[in-house]
């Protein structure tokens, strides 16, 4: 069983008399409706909270919102619907928040029938003040704030324009006409793809690729015969039609669309598709549907230019259309994914890799758990996490799993112990190692969130019923104090902390339904005072990540290096604090054949580290083509992983080859890559 | 079969210094903590503090802070401590010993080979 | 820095005897705790690591429990060779050592 509250846990002294004197409570003068939350900014404390509420009336619905502004991380909130001027605001588009620290926030309001355009309501002072705005078009979608200057916003219309705006939004532009999807890169680039024959859907896989690089001055058609594009990374990726028939496959770019490679990956059907699981400046993780209608595919992890690519994992979860994925990012711990795979009796196990998906294993059973009905042998299973894809099938998960970068090692997720996923209730299950091992944290589904580092954990039992009690633990789960935060029971709808988990304030949120009133409430609880003190040095230990085998003398070893952290001793009751930073210490490892994957024309046999050349590439539909001409390909038959650092060692040489491939799609043609201007 | 290895006795003059050396021989020296630990004669057992080979990663218990210094050196699998301003209290049999690890953990899982001990005398 | 108490401080035990030996932490320490043996004039033996897990080459008679800030050393049935002072040592925090137990003949 879980870790209780039993006497041996070690309370924190007086926790009650602490937590009472820092819980603000506050009500909501709405009828329910609902509500939505965004932060604005990093360490302002600033909260804007939107509720809107419907009416239905004989012929439309009449819409009302109102607006609260917290400058104190939720303690206490004050309505300022009345600078959006009363406007129902159109919670679609939510609340459009810039980036980092700049303050901006734009809100689309919701306008009668006959206007000649939408009106949004634009603030550059963390929402003190805002500016309306009348829009010389109807938005589709909410405004794009462009990553590199919050002030060049972009948004399409509902006639398929290009809108773009250089003052946050005071003026509009309308750039380009026919436009289906756009996208900032990075240099305040926009991509965005058009069509020609009437409609986005009828020009499907006919579609052009634009780029412009001064905010619509000038164009440059870098891509026809386009079904989608997509950036992850330091990538540009596109998926194209091929000549012959009605498959497509991908291409890739890594200097903006300038020049484009066919990624070494199988093309795909009609009713197939292609999804970017993952991407960073090394390397992406690339989903590659099966034919049919099976539910799952194949990952495929890339080299650093994108073009060659290793297969990953077999009967990858992922339901048709691109629905639904399990794939995650363990942000605590470099080189962690999760994900499930659809095994061939149709049952749902977790898989995770440890190493940026060279290697994937079933997660190691619990110590203090037993095997689920699901198994075949009671002494021997696996974890099993819920993700996305329980959550979408409405099993018993309020929460998919929990990760945070400054949290190291920590890993929040429900789950269940068997040979699969099962449909019973689950548990909360904890990882301190970046999913190595793990341990039951508690008994039965929750909300959880990460506070001050992971200096608290916040736990909340999910039910229908109304609660009134929240869990929080200072050992990284291990033992747990329950805090009455009120002694009226709310029905929960929500924990909310400020993003980053660096915060020691936990929103809870929730309404109170009384025979004729149903009001919002929030709670909010600040653990300052239960981390009394600041953390000192003695407060750390030393702690070696992907740590396995301490006699392997490359132990810790992952993509070339390994990282000891200090982390915060169980024990300890401290404050980690806003400004705490990770400390960490790298250590490059010797190279091993396990350093490197194939390239191009070699691949692995199975159980074998080598590369080995493909003695012809048949049954490979596979085409490889390098900025679209015959290129001269040289290689040893070993790259090195992206992203790995190591050094010495083993150093593969053999004779190098001279690779010729006949590149065959038009889509690179130059004839193509033709530049226009406004 | 991991050994840990120490130096011969010592006797020294209160005020000066001394530096023991513990020698790891037959596992991987680097990918354990070594911690320091004393027994004063018919007294229990106390802890100085420890260090990590690798980045050589040191933490020290309060009541030495300022006056010991562990230090590691990889090359030779050898971890020393160095104990200053020597009184007579410090007369003690000084233990290396080597942290057990089943995680990543250096420090958690209690201290499974430990050197033969180095007697160190302070007197005038 | 936490502080260990164990007791008893002595005890006089016979071979076959169960013997039981606590240790108390000022504070939480989960389950963070070894047990030593130690005979003069020897360095300490690890018997216990993470308050019950038995450290390989050490016979099953002795045991540990507990988890917070209570634990227990227990030896089943008490051998000749096991007349020694018992230390305990918490690995969470700086690491400190229980004041010890000496076992002896009854």
């Known amino acids: 069983s879980a870790p209780g509250e039993d006497e041996e846990c070690g309370r924190v002294r007086d926790f009650v008399a602490k937590l009472a004197n820092n819980t603000h409570q506050h009500v909501f003068d709405d009828l329910r409706g609902s509500v939505s939350l965004s932060w604005v900014g990093d360490s302002t404390g600033v909260i804007l909270v939107l509720t809107t509420f419907h009416v239905p009336l004989v012929i439309m619905t009449f819409g009302q919102s109102k607006l609260y502004r917290s400058e104190d991380y939720g303690k206490n909130f004050k309505d300022i619907t009345d600078l959006i001027n009363n406007t129902f605001i159109r919670t679609e588009f939510g609340m459009a928040i810039g980036p980092e620290n700049s303050g901006k926030v734009v809100l689309t309001a919701e306008v009668s029938g006959g206007s000649r355009g939408g009106r949004i309501f634009r603030s550059s002072d963390f929402a003190k003040n805002f500016v309306q705005t009348d829009l010389p078009f109807h938005p589709l979608t909410q405004m794009m704030y462009s990553p590199q200057n919050s002030d060049y916003l972009l948004a399409l219309s509902t006639e398929n324009g290009l809108w773009v705006s250089k003052n946050f939004g005071g003026k509009w532009e309308e750039i380009h006409k026919a436009v289906c999807l756009a996208k900032w890169g990075s240099d305040n680039t926009i991509f965005f793809t058009t069509y020609a024959n009437g409609s986005c859907k009828a020009d499907l896989g006919a579609l052009e690729l634009w780029r412009t690089s001064d905010l619509g001055k000038s164009f440059k058609t870098i891509g026809v015969k386009i079904y989608s594009f997509g950036l992850g990374g330091r990538f540009l990726f596109a998926s194209v039609m091929a000549d012959k028939d009605t498959t497509r496959r991908i291409h890739v770019s890594t200097d903006q669309g300038d020049t484009w490679s066919m990624a070494q990956l199988p093309s795909v059907g009609q009713e197939q598709f292609y999804s970017i699981l993952a991407a960073n400046d090394d390397m992406v993780f690339m989903h590659v549907d099966e034919p049919g209608d099976t539910g799952f595919g194949t990952i495929f992890t890339s080299d650093d230019r994108g073009i060659v690519y290793s297969k990953s994992l077999d009967r990858h979860l992922y339901t048709t259309t691109g629905g639904e994925t399990d794939f995650t990012n363990v942000t605590s711990l470099r080189g962690v994914y999760i994900t499930s795979v659809l095994s061939e009796d149709n049952s749902i196990q977790t898989m995770i890799t440890f190493d940026q998906g060279g290697r994937w294993t079933h997660l190691r059973k619990p110590e203090n758990s037993e095997c689920d009905a699901t198994a075949k042998n009671k002494n021997e299973c696996s974890l099993h996490i819920h993700a996305s894809y329980s959550i979408s099938q409405k099993l018993n998960v309020p929460m998919a799993p929990l990760s945070e970068p400054n949290a190291v090692g920590i890993v929040i997720a429900h789950g269940s112990v068997g040979d699969a996923i099962s449909v019973m209730v689950p548990d909360v299950y904890i990882s301190d190692d970046g999913g190595y091992s793990w341990t039951k944290m508690l008994e039965g589904p929750h909300y959880y969130t990460i506070l001050d580092s992971g200096g608290i954990i916040v736990a909340i039992e999910h039910s229908s019923r109304p609660i009134n009690v929240i869990k929080f633990s200072t050992d990284e789960g291990q033992c747990w104090q329950t805090y009455t935060f009120t002694r009226d029971p709310i029905y929960f709808t929500g924990l909310a902390s400020e993003p980053g988990a660096r915060s020691m304030n936990i929103s809870i949120w929730g309404f109170t339904e009384s025979f004729l009133t149903s009001q919002w409430v929030s709670y909010t609880i600040d653990f300052k005072d239960i981390l009394e003190r600041n953390c000192e040095e003695k407060d750390y230990t030393a702690w070696l990540a992907h740590s396995t085998d301490p006699e392997d003398y490359e132990d810790g070893c992952i993509l070339g290096y390994k990282e000891q952290f200090l982390r915060l001793r169980k024990s300890s009751v401290c404050q980690n604090g806003r400004d705490y930073v990770v400390t960490k210490q790298p250590s490059i490892c010797l190279c091993s054949l396990e350093d490197f994957l194939c390239d191009f024309g070699y691949y692995r046999p199975e159980n074998d580290s080598k590369c080995v050349e493909q003695p012809e590439l048949k049954g490979h539909d596979l085409e490889f083509c390098l900025y679209g001409r015959e290129e001269h390909l040289t290689t040893n038959g070993y790259r090195k992983i992206p992203g790995d650092k190591c050094q010495g060692g083993v150093n593969p040489v053999r004779e190098v080859k001279d690779l010729k491939k006949k590149c065959t799609s038009n889509f690179l043609s130059p004839e193509k890559q033709n530049s226009k201007s406004n | 079969q991991v050994q840990l290895v120490q130096s011969g006795a010592e006797v020294k003059k209160p005020g000066s210094s001394v530096k023991v050396s513990c020698k790891a021989s037959?596992?991987?020296?680097?990918?354990?903590?070594i911690s320091w630990v004393r027994q004063a004669p018919g007294q229990g057992l106390e802890w100085m503090g420890g260090?990590?080979?690798?980045?050589?990663?040191?933490n020290y218990a309060q009541k030495f802070q300022g006056r010991v210094t562990i230090t590691a050196d990889e090359s030779t699998s050898t971890a020393y401590m160095e104990l200053s301003s020597l009184r007579s209290e410090d007369t003690a049999v000084y233990y290396c010993?080597?942290?057990?690890?089943?995680?990543?953990?250096?420090?958690?899982?209690?201290?499974?080979?430990w050197g033969q001990g180095t007697t160190v005398t302070v007197s005038s | 820095d936490i502080q260990m108490t164990q007791s008893p401080s002595t005890l006089s035990a016979s071979v076959g005897d169960r013997v039981t030996i606590t240790c108390r932490a000022s504070?939480?320490?989960?389950?963070?705790l070894a047990w030593y043996q130690q005979k003069p004039g020897k360095a300490p033996k690890l018997l216990i690591y993470?308050?019950?897990s038995l450290e390989s080459g050490v016979p099953s008679r002795f045991s540990g429990s507990g988890s917070g800030t209570e634990f227990t050393l227990t030896i089943s049935s008490l051998q000749p060779d096991d007349f020694a002072t018992y230390y305990c040592?918490?690995?969470?925090?700086?690491?400190?050592f229980g004041g010890g137990t000496k076992v002896e003949i009854k």
């Open positions: 993470k308050a019950s």
């Open positions: 504070q939480s320490i989960s389950s963070w």
């Open positions: 040592q918490q690995a969470d925090g700086h690491i400190t």
């Open positions: 010993a080597r942290q057990g690890r089943k995680t990543g953990y250096y420090y958690y899982y209690g201290m499974d080979v």
């Open positions: 260090i990590i080979p690798i980045g050589g990663w040191a």
């Open positions: 037959g596992g991987t020296f680097r990918n354990y903590a």
